[in-house]
C-alpha cells in the first residue's frame, strides 16, 4: 500500500509532543516524525540511546 503524507489537520497540531505531525491520507491517521533525540508513537519519550 502506497501512503501519501501531508500536513496533519489543524485539529492535530499538538498531536506530536516532540516532532512533526504527518497525515497518512489513505489510512486517515496521523503519524509523527520525531525530532532528533525523541522516540515513541507521538515522540513522547526521550531516546536514552541517542
Amino acid at each position: 500500500v502506497v501512503s501519501h503524507f501531508n500536513d496533519c489537520p489543524d485539529s492535530h497540531t499538538q498531536f506530536c509532543f516532540h516532532g512533526t505531525c504527518r497525515f497518512l491520507v489513505q489510512e486517515d491517521k496521523p503519524a509523527c516524525v520525531c525530532h532528533s533525540g525523541y522516540v515513541g508513537a507521538r515522540c513522547e519519550h526521550a531516546d536514552l540511546l541517542a
Epitope: N6, C8, P9, D10, S11, D28, K29, P30
Partner: antibody
Amino acid sequence: DVQLQESGPGLVKPSQSLSLTCTVTGYSITSDYAWNWIRLFPGNKLEWMGFINYSGNTSYNPSLKSRISITRDTSKNQFFLKLNSLTTDDTATYYCARGGLSRFPYWGQGTLVTVSA
Amino acid sequence: DIQMTQTTSSLSASLGDRVTISCRSSQDIRNYLNWYQQKPDGTVKLLIYYTSRSHSGVPSRFSGSGSGTDYSLTISNLEQEDIATYFCQQGNMFPFTFGGGTKLEIK
C-alpha cells in the same frame, strides 16, 4: 466488512433522556478508529455529536457538551449515546459512524427519534 | 466553528448531464473536505475524501476538486441511481461540520 446498526426508542418525551445503541460487526471497536454519533435534522442539517475512540477517550461537540455522554461495552462490541434534557429540537435521524482523523467512511442506516409529548 | 455553505439546496438535471455541486468553508480547511451521498432511504456513503480522492467502490463519474475555502463535487454523466442529497464536510478542525446539503433531482 464493518457494519454498524443503531437501535433505540423512536419516540421520547421532552425533558427526558435519549439512549441509543450502536452495534458494530466485522471490526472490534477496541482495535482502532473513532466511533461517532452524527444526527440529521429535518431540513437536512447534519451535526457531528461526538465520538469514543478505540482506547475509550471521548470528544464531544461543544454545543452538546453539557448534555451528551458516549460510552461503550467492549464485550458486546457496542457503543452508546446518552443525550439528556431533550427538547423538540432534538428530533432527528441519529447515525453511528466509524471515523478516522478527518472523515466518516462507514455509517449505520440511521434511526429516527421524535421528541414529542 | 467552521461554517460550511452549500449555496444550492436543490438542483434539477437530466440523465447524462454533467453536474457540479459547490461547497464553501468560512476559513481555509487545507483540503480536508469530504463528500457524502444520502439516498432517499437514508443510507449515507462517503464518496470523495481529502478533496479529490475516491473512496473504495465509488464510480469514476464522481470527482472532486478545490482548495482553500472553495470546493466542488462533479458527477460527469448523471445516472438515475445518483438521485440523492449530497453533503460536504470539513475534517480540518473540531467540531467537524457539514454543509446544508444539495438535493439532486431528475428533470
